[in-house]
Amino acid sequence: AESCTSRPHITVVEGEPFYLKHCSCSLAHEIETTTKSWYKSSGSQEHVELNPRSSSRIALHDCVLEFWPVELNDTGSYFFQMKNYTQKWKLNVIRRNKHSCFTERQVTSKIVEVKKFFQITCENSYYQTLVNSTSLYKNCKKLLLENNKNPTIKKNAEFEDQGYYSCVHFLHHNGKLFNITKTFNITIVEDRSNIVPVLLGPKLNHVAVELGKNVRLNCSALLNEEDVIYWMFGEENGSDPNIHEEKEMRIMTPEGKWHASKVLRIENIGESNLNVLYNCTVASTGGTDTKSFILVRKADMADIPGHVFTR
């Protein structure tokens, strides 16, 4: 069942079918004998009870006040009363834009990130049984889609998808043809969620070591979930059995990004491990960052300025 009209302020476009559904509908069914009344007041006008005789455009059902269609002079305050329950709405009926297939003031804006899932489904559950056909327009040009009952777009967003999409439902009521238009302003934006990954700390690190000892080189990065971090060293990486990559550790940041750490452990340091570049790289679709470590014998430390050392 269609949910009730809970919004107290409603704007609609002239010439379209429209309904108000009160929010004690299930209760009203239980108390069939209870008197239920709909009222309208506009400006200084007193409450006027509504009934089908008030206007040929108005229809009253158990829970619903229908307009076939709503017109500019329907602007005003509406009340539903049943026993000690009252619900009030303020209705503003605006002019239709005669030069467009939609009215700008009745547009729902949506922002979709490029490459993310983008969907438009033309549905109208309340009038579903009365709808003959539905068309979907982009910038007021009809899109040729297979389903003419519930036209749908489902795809990964591209920048060309940006525009105004209007679902137009055509329906008959009492021998007259009506249409209901729902328009979405779709803006396609760059992927806001991804950062360019960055490695933390200096780009070049000289590490003072002693032969025969062990060292742990820690590579830390701020990255996206799908990014990778890896170590590379020498032309034929991995030929040294004393070099081990530890399991990558990740912690999510409060911003929803990831802090990753990957340690390269070099055991029983030998001459072959000195003055070699051990490169740590973080990579994403948006770019890469690399930092390098060079192992230097402690005895040779005096040859290198102090500020380039990692101890």
Epitope: D227, V228, Y230, M232, E236, T281, A283, T285, G286, T288
Partner: nanobody, 115 residues
Framework: EVQLVESGGGLVQPGGSLRLSCAAS????????MGWYRRAPGNQRELVAW???????GNKNSVKGRFTCSRDNAKNTVYLQMNSLKPEDTAVYYC?????????WGQGTQVTVSS
């Protein structure tokens, strides 16, 4: 936009072999160093083997002497020959760029080593 499609995975007994393929559509591998990454349950993706744009290969200690990368630039395809497979090689395998910005990840191909 480049789309990567990995294939060739499957269930294999310890000591067995598999050859994985990775094809690119909508772009080219040419001039790029390419690598094979794997992701075991509970782990992040790790680089295991690679081949540079000029054909120099490399791999990690854990797969040393067992895994080898090759490439066919004309077919825009990269391969991973996996020999002497071990249960710890069980993972989803992905190909992607090494030493540069990566392409969006493909679906990967599942390799399961079990008796």
């Amino acid at each position: 936009e480049v789309q990567l499609v990995e294939s060739g995975g499957g269930l294999v007994q310890p000591g067995g072999s598999l050859r994985l393929s990775c094809a690119a559509s909508g772009g080219s591998f040419s001039g790029k160093d390419m690598g094979w990454y794997r992701r075991a349950p509970g782990n992040q993706r790790e680089l295991v083997a690679w081949i540079t744009s000029i054909g120099i290969t490399g791999n990690k200690n854990s797969v040393k002497g067992r895994f080898t990368c090759s490439r066919d630039n004309a077919k825009n395809t990269v391969y991973l020959q996996m020999n002497s497979l071990k249960p710890e090689d069980t993972a989803v395998y992905y190909c992607n760029v090494v030493n540069g910005p990566i392409f969006p990840w493909g679906q990967g191909t599942q390799v399961t080593v079990s008796s």
